[in-house]
């Protein structure tokens, strides 16, 4: 649906004129001139940069820019006492230390205050002991070594690899094993891609670079002394001992060339099978210890950070709706940034300001939106999504009440291959019906759209024809939009290609090597990729803000409720007999997914023939689009976890990054042939079934007619 | 792969002075430590001398405290070594080393990348 009919129309002022508004060579401009120093959670530097976007917001037309701050705990390493992991004899003497930095990049060095590496939120502490290799450290590496190899973590300190899931759960599942100590290393099978060089004459990860990182399991927490409120002046904290998340052992992070050091000592046991072998060239020995000659020799580690409760600064811009004030869509990405950012975040921000300065533009020129936008700028996302969430936490009535939508804008790129977007199902067609007519950047598709590219390189698995659109899971800010507040959100940026590239993530994420020159030599030099990411996080606030009946299509939710619940059906079903003897059944979570279905449909149909010149109606129409989301949030949240409350996704328990569906019933399954006592157990899968049953028949409900 | 490439060495007598330069290939090494080290015939290999990725902090074994200078250029990708006062006892051959690492002092394991050698010969 076109926004042509937008308030103050003239034909200029329609999304084609905001779109046609956005340029590259903008986009290069703010990226370059935000990644020339660190910005670092908590710093003056980031305060500055705070300022300086807060200024430049004013400049570009919004109505009002104010930063909120608030007081949370962050976490630094010792200036004068530097953390480092030493290999020592018998003697106690260290006879191997990992460096205490990354060498810096060329033209970098004499950049001060750039944060060595390691792991936010580690507690001080010098353990010393014998290695076990963990291999990902995943649920399923630890099931491995504890229950077929026998191997005993506990009181040994464990090395595990970057990737595959959030470095936190690989903390959580070495704590829950015993360890007293983990190492994370970012290993060349997962950070060196083959064929291209290492920074600065390629994008891969040298041997000395190190992904930094917090390893906490918030649970969506935010501030872990104030959960569930706003860490403000008059704010009550607990202590240290109470504070969400925090891990209990000592973490520290080290690149692959430290790492071989440690590993090429390695006895023990074997790997159990190839996938545990990296590509150093090692024999990825799982241990316990060292092999006969080095026997004597143990791991130390010595970690002296400091956790502190330190000032953040979010910067808030708000453009004014002409028609329905009380509706706020967000655009909203962090500015936080380990060392220099140069993807991550500013990849993101640098394409937010070209946003605002577009649409400041359009208002400029006498154009508002039907809709109010917000524009975020948070901080303190790298300590744990801290910013994004204090402020939902001090506005959270609002938002429950107001919020249409959110958006994200953290990195824009993580690869050149095709476009990425996770969101909720009441986007899917939003996205599609936007990219459709969006031009690819892509080489091979000239005067293609961006939709053909993105389906052709990134095919649905269960739709042919159309493009994948993944579950949105954690990791970012949209956490506490959709995972709490049951508002409606989106992610969008240009990936790498997945199938021939199956490092995590980008290879110098979160190093002191993500560079602006990283960006400009080797993944965008023309920035069109960026720019087309702004023309889709930009049209997707365009049409959530302006559009007269708002852009969700709920029959695709119903779509989704069936997958899902087939899928969770059969997970269910690999234990038949225990169905059968505890007498769970998925008929009332079925029937509530057909009557979702039946409902949704019904309401697509009145959506379609409503008299949309009625004020009255058009709101109320609105209204239920916008309180679907919120329709699937359970105020009493997940087992665990208060702060996850929707009930049809959540934050993987294995994985933060990963999103899950029905993960209430989902974890109630889980490893469910190890509980101790089964008939508790399927107790709580048959309560789960019930709950999540419950929340998509009383969703359905509020889609039908209202009297 | 990275290469250093070591140059300079040569044949001087006691007492004078030899400057001898490594160039690395690849400027993916250019800020890391470096270091040259040195092996004469029938002995270990051994550092005598490494500095910072900026030239801050330099490291010299007790041998050639106060005669050798090590000094870089990271934007020539170059490393240096100023032998002055050259005794009988420097002849080696020697070799350069780079560490992607902030550690300066270190065996020949400890370093990452390493040159083929130049031969310095002080004759008495």
């Known amino acids: 649906k076109s926004s042509n009919e937008a308030t103050n129309i003239t034909p200029k002022h329609n999304m084609k004129a905001f779109l046609d508004e956005l340029k590259a060579e903008n986009i290069k401009k703010f990226l370059y001139n935000f990644t020339q120093i660190p910005h670092l959670a908590g710093t003056e530097q980031n305060f500055q940069l705070a300022k300086q976007i807060q200024s430049q917001w004013k400049e570009f037309g919004l109505d009002s820019v104010e930063l909120a701050h608030y007081d949370v705990l962050l976490s630094y390493p010792n200036k004068t006492h530097p953390n480092y992991i030493s290999i020592i004899n018998e003697d106690g003497n260290e006879i191997f230390n990992t460096s205490l930095f990354e060498p810096p990049p060329p033209g970098y060095e004499n950049v001060s205050d750039i944060v060595p590496p390691f792991s936010a939120f580690s507690p001080q502490g010098m353990p010393e002991g014998d290695l076990v290799y963990v291999n990902y450290a995943r649920t399923e590496d630890f099931f491995k070594l504890e229950r077929d190899m026998k191997i005993n973590c506990s009181g040994k300190i464990v090395i595990a690899r970057y990737g595959k899931v959030f470095r936190g759960n690989k903390v959580k599942n070495a704590q829950l094993a015993g360890a007293k100590g983990v190492i994370l290393y970012s290993d060349p099978a997962d950070y060196f891609a083959p064929g291209v060089k290492s920074y600065p004459d390629g994008w891969n990860l040298p041997g000395g670079g190190v992904q930094r990182g917090n390893i906490l399991n918030l649970n969506g927490a935010g501030d872990p002394l104030t959960p569930g409120y706003p860490a403000n002046e008059y704010a009550y904290r607990r202590g240290i001992a109470e504070a969400v998340g925090l891990p209990s052992i000592p973490v520290h992070p080290i690149g692959y060339y430290d790492a071989q050091k440690l590993l090429e000592k390695m006895g023990g046991s074997a790997p159990p099978d190839s996938s545990w072998r990296g590509s150093l060239k090692v024999p990825y020995n799982v241990g316990p210890g060292f092999t006969g000659n080095f026997s004597t020799q143990k791991v130390k580690m010595h970690i002296h950070s400091t956790n502190e409760v330190t000032r953040i600064y979010n910067v808030i811009g708000t453009l004014r709706g002409a028609v329905e004030p009380d509706r706020y869509v967000i655009l909203g990405g962090h500015r936080d940034s380990w060392v220099f950012g140069g993807i991550d975040p500013q990849s993101g921000a640098a394409v937010v300001h070209e946003i605002v300065r577009s649409f400041g533009t359009l208002k400029k020129e006498g154009w508002r939106p039907r809709r109010t936008i917000l524009f975020a700028s948070w901080d303190a996302e790298e300590f744990g999504l801290l910013g994004s969430t204090e402020w939902a936490e001090e506005n959270s009535r609002l938002l429950q009440e107001r919020g249409v939508a959110y958006i994200n804008a953290d990195s824009s790129i993580e690869g050149n291959y095709t476009l990425r977007v996770d969101c909720t199902p009441l986007m899917y067609s939003l996205v599609h019906n936007l990219t459709k007519e969006l031009k690819s950047p892509d080489e091979g598709f000239e005067g293609k759209s961006l939709y053909e590219s993105w389906t052709k390189k990134s095919p649905s698995p269960e739709f042919s024809g159309m493009p994948r659109i993944s579950k949105l899971g954690s990791g970012n800010d949209f956490e506490v939009f959709f995972q709490r507040l049951g508002i409606a959100s989106g992610r969008a940026r240009y990936t790498k290609n997945w199938e021939t590239n199956k490092f995590s993530g980008y290879p110098l994420y979160h190093s002191v090597y993500e560079t602006y020159e990283l960006v400009e030599k080797f993944y965008d030099p023309m920035f069109k990729y960026h720019l087309t990411v702004a023309q889709v996080r930009g049209g997707m606030v365009f049409e959530l803000a302006n559009s007269i009946v708002l852009p969700f299509d709920c029959r695709d939710y119903a779509v989704v409720l069936r997958k899902y619940a087939d899928k969770i059906y059969s997970i269910s079903m690999k234990h038949p007999q225990e169905m059968k003897t505890y007498s769970v059944s998925f008929d009332s979570l079925f029937s509530a997914v057909k009557n979702f279905t039946e409902i949704a449909s019904k309401f697509s149909e009145r959506l379609q023939d409503f008299d949309k010149s009625n004020p009255i109606v058009l709101r109320m129409m609105n209204d239920q689009l916008m309180f679907l989301e919120r329709a699937f949030i359970d105020p009493l949240g997940l087992p665990d976890r208060p702060f996850y409350r929707h009930v049809i996704y959540a934050p993987s328990s294995h994985n933060k990054y990963a999103g899950e569906s029905f993960p209430g019933i989902y974890d109630a399954l889980f490893d469910i042939e190890s509980k101790v006592d089964p008939s508790k157990a399927w107790g709580e899968v048959k309560r789960q079934i019930y709950v999540a049953a419950f929340t998509v028949q009383a969703a359905a409900e509020t889609l039908s007619e209202v009297a | 792969e990275v290469q250093l490439v070591e140059s300079g060495g040569g044949l001087v007598q006691a007492g004078g002075s030899l400057r001898i330069s490594c160039t690395a290939s690849e400027r993916s090494v250019s800020t890391y430590t470096k270091g040259w080290f040195r092996q004469a015939p029938g002995k270990e290999r051994h550092l005598v001398a490494a500095?910072?990725?900026?030239?801050?902090?330099?490291y010299y074994s007790d041998s050639v405290k106060g005669r050798f200078t090590i000094s870089r250029d990271n934007v020539k990708n170059t490393v240096n070594l100023q032998m002055n006062s050259l005794k009988p006892e420097d002849t080696a051959v020697y070799f350069c080393?780079?560490?992607?690492?902030?550690?300066?002092?270190?065996?020949?394991?400890?370093?990452?990348?390493w040159g083929q050698g130049t031969q310095v010969t002080v004759s008495s």
């Open positions: 500095i910072s990725y900026n030239g801050d902090t330099t």
């Open positions: 080393a780079a560490r992607g690492s902030s550690w300066l002092y270190g065996t020949w394991d400890d370093y990452h990348y």
